[in-house]
Structure formats: C-alpha cells, structure tokens
C-alpha cells in the first residue's frame, strides 16, 4: 500500500485547511492509527491529533478545538484532518504517520500555505474607518482642550472681576470721603443758600468717553448681562474721571489747603440757576485750576 497526500495545501486565512492523508492499501489491510504532527518547529515535532481505530480522534492539548475529522461519510483508511480557522502561524510543514496492519507504518509530509487575501473595497473601507476614527479622536481632544481653555478664562475673568470690584470699592470709599469733605468745606466757606449739594452737579461719569464697556460677544467670557461686564481698565478710568471732575486733590492730607483754595476759586466762576451750577460768562468758558486739571 501507499499514502496519498498533497505536497502543498493552500488555504485562505480564516478558512479550514484539509490536511489529506489517505492509505491506499490492499484488501484486508487496516489502519490502526494516524498521528498528525507539525514538524518545522525547532524543538521537534508537535502533535496535532491522533486518529485511533479504537479510541477515535484525540486532539493534542496544543490544538484543542482546532482539529476535526472531515464530515461523514468517513473511510476507515482516510486519516485526513481539518485544521479549523487557519492563521498565518499555522503555515509550515506537517506530517502524518500511519500505522497499518499487517503492512506496517507509512509517513507523508506536506506544506501548508496560508494566503492573506485583501479585498480592495474592504481595504478602502477600513482606511475610511481609520480616517473617521482619527477625526473623531482629534475632535474629542480639541473639545477637551477648548473646555479647559474656557474654564481657565472663566476663572481668570472671575478673578479679575473680583479684583476690579475690590478696587472700585476702595476708590468709591475714598471718593465718598472726598465728596463729604468737599461739601462740608463748601458750606463752611460759602453760606450762600443757592449752593447745591453735590448730587445736583450735572456732570456724570457714565457719559464720559473713557467709559469703555466690554461689548464682547463671547457669552462664556461674560456671566453678567451684556454691557455690565467692565474691564479693569474701564473701571479705573471711570473712577479717575469722577475723582478728577469732583475733587482733583482726592482727599490726601498734604493737599487739603490747595484743595480748599481750588474750591473757593471754582465757586467764584459758577452761578446757581434753576437748581444747577452754571459757569459765569467769561472769554472762553473754560476754567483751569492751579494744578492744570480740566474741569
């Protein structure tokens, strides 16, 4: 008798590979067992399976669940096996050893080739998937960075607003003191019933051209209603304007005498009409005090 097999078995990746080993013997000859092994491993042969006439198919632990017999009907002289779901690591040399009675043992060797077939459409689909996945990842990262930026900006703006409010409060306190001192002095020097309290003066900071409002359209940057978010610079400028208009000396002790003199001089140039202070008619209608401040 003799063994029928193939020199090379070619299978597509993921498909089942049939490893053929058929004993063509004389009548009355029997196959006792067929041992399949992988034989290109450096450490020696590695058993795949043993097909035994009495005990049936025994798959080696190393190939558990991966080796089967071909579907029925089965010829008792057929020692072929199926290697399930071939992977590239399965590519290599295999042999079957057939023990027969009474003819003895036979062996055959074959090479298993595992082909990797790439479908061009599938491949482009995978590329598209990869690109879209990359875009999503980049988008997510960008969004996270933007959120981080927004948080930083919000925290910074809150910090600056708090600082600005503190400064405004401080200046307003100073301003109030200055105003009270000015009014007191005004009453003590000029007991003229026409003199009006400070609130009557028709000069308002809000109308000053330096009153810079933050009209930014970024809603994240402004938590207050539009037009209420003042920059630190604007707030300081407004306070400076008010201070300069109402009390050039801003209430410091070393300048009190200068300030008294300035108020006296100023009152000589204004006249009370209909509850409002109006400038007395002069050559140019502008009064500049001794310190050079515009009033």
């Amino acid at each position: 008798g003799e063994l029928e097999t193939s020199d090379v078995v070619t299978v597509v990746l993921g498909q089942d590979a049939k490893l053929p080993c058929f004993y063509r013997g004389d009548s009355g000859e029997q196959v006792g067992q067929v041992a399949w092994a992988r034989v290109d491993a450096g450490e020696g042969a590695q058993e795949l399976a043993l097909l035994h006439s009495k005990y049936g198919l025994h798959v080696s632990p190393a190939y558990e669940g991966r080796v089967e017999q071909p579907p029925p009907p089965r010829n008792p002289l057929d020692g072929s096996v199926l290697l399930r779901n071939a992977v590239q690591a399965d590519e290599g040399e295999y042999e079957c050893r057939v023990s027969t009675f009474p003819a003895g043992s036979f062996q055959a060797r074959l090479r298993l080739r595992v082909l990797v077939v790439l479908d061009p459409q599938e491949d482009s689909g995978k590329q598209v998937d990869l690109v879209s996945a990359s875009v999503v990842v980049v988008g997510v990262i960008a969004a996270l960075l933007f959120c981080l930026l927004v948080v930083v900006v919000v925290l910074m703006s809150r910090y600056h607003r708090r600082k600005a409010q503190q400064m405004t409060q401080k200046y307003e306190e100073e301003l109030t003191l200055t105003r009270e001192n000015s009014i007191r002095r005004l009453h003590s020097h000029h007991t003229d019933p026409r003199s009006q309290p400070e609130e009557s003066v028709g000069l308002r900071a809000e109308g000053h051209p330096d009153s810079l409002k933050d009209n930014s359209s970024c809603s994240v940057m402004s938590e207050e209603p539009e037009g209420r978010s003042y920059s630190t610079l604007t707030t300081v400028r407004e306070i400076e304007t008010q201070t300069e208009l109402l009390s050039p000396g801003s209430g410091r002790a070393e300048e009190e005498e200068d300030q008294d003199e300035g108020i006296k001089q100023a009152m000589n140039h204004f006249v009370q009409e209909n509850g409002t202070l109006r400038a007395k008619p002069t050559g140019n209608g502008i009064y500049i005090n001794g310190r050079g401040h515009l009033v």
């Epitope: 450490e43 020696g44 590695q46 058993e47 632990p61 190393a62 042999e95």
Partner: antibody
Amino acid sequence: EVQLQQSGPDLVKPGASVKISCKASGYSFTGHYMHWVKQSHGKSLEWIGRVNPNNGGSSYNQKFKDKAILTVDKSSTTAYMELRSLTSEDSAVYYCARDPLGGSYGFAYWGQGTLVTVSA
Amino acid sequence: DIVLTQSPASLAVSLGQRATISCRASQSVTTSSYSYMHWYQQKPGQPPKLLIKYASNLESGVPARFSGSGSGTDFTLNIHPVEEEDTATYYCQHSWEIPYTFGGGTKLEMK
C-alpha cells in the same frame, strides 16, 4: 518551575482499588497531556496511557485498558489514575510525566513516583 | 506494538572511556523530518531523566558528553568521556505511535 507532586505510597489488599494523584504546578495544566508510566521492581518502564486535561479524553496502552482509569480535575490541576482489581502483578512504582512542549514527544518532567504494594 | 530491544543489558566502562548503548526498533520510527526516538537516564530511587529527544537532540541542561545518533530502526547513545556520576540505567523510548514503548534498559557501571 514545572513540578509534578504525587501522592504517597499505598499498601492495598488484592482485589481492591487505589487512586493515585499527581498535582501539577508551574505551567499551563491544560496545555499538555499527562502520561502515566509503570515500573515494576528491577524492571523496565511501561507506558500506561495519557489524558488530555482539557476534556478528560484518554488514550490507553491496550494492556492496561481494563486496569487503569485516567481522570483530571482542572480546578485543582490534578491528574488521577485509579487502578482496579489489584493483584501482586500491579505492585510497582507509578509515575506521572509530561512532555517537553505542548503536544511534543518525550517525557521531560516526571513526578517522584508512587509506590503501590499489593499484599494480603 | 513496536518492540525496542536494547543491548547490552549491562556495561562496565572505565572512567574517561566511551560507553555505547544500542536500541533497535521492530519497525522504522523515522520520517523525513524526525526520528521519534528518545533516551533516558535513571538512577536508583529517582524518576527517569530525559537526555536525548528525537534521536539526536540534546535536552536542555544535559552535559555535552552525551550524544545520540541513528535513524530508521537502529539508534545509539554515546557517553564520552564517562564520569562516575553516569552510573545509572539507560532506556530508549519511541513515540511513533500509541502505545509508546521503552527498551529493556542498559545498566552502566564503572570498572
């Protein structure tokens, strides 16, 4: 380190049964056949059979087909061999053994052996 | 079953000399890839120890003074130079088919 630890010696009466254990450690228990080998005093070695720890499937030397039953307990990574209807001929040292690599041939690792003495 | 016949049954060799042990199989155990024959050493009270696998491949950790050769049905184990610690019984074993079988053993002693 691969280790095969066998149960201690047994003295049993003729006609009785004995169950020898082989506790495996240091490797993937389900990745290798467990073989059993008999050595009578002053004599050569005889291969009894092998068991696949994955599914409990076993192959036997026809001479021991009615004498030995090979089983495994995956949870405890232990292989067992039960010897039935014992006679004085069954007095011997029994070894469990493992192949060098998964599915390769030859016995690279051996248990220390279990001496079974059958005596009235 | 494949029968393995070892010779001689016992052997006495002087230290430093060569010891040669033969094993004959009742049928060929060789393919175009490998010979399915292995050699073991066993000392009293110990389990066997694998020396040579696939007729000529030295097992890891085994001294190079051990070597194996042969194919088909005739195989040889050589020990050279023999050392005191090599006193033991040596067995051949095939794994061509089930049942695997062992040779009768060769007892090596020092002169």
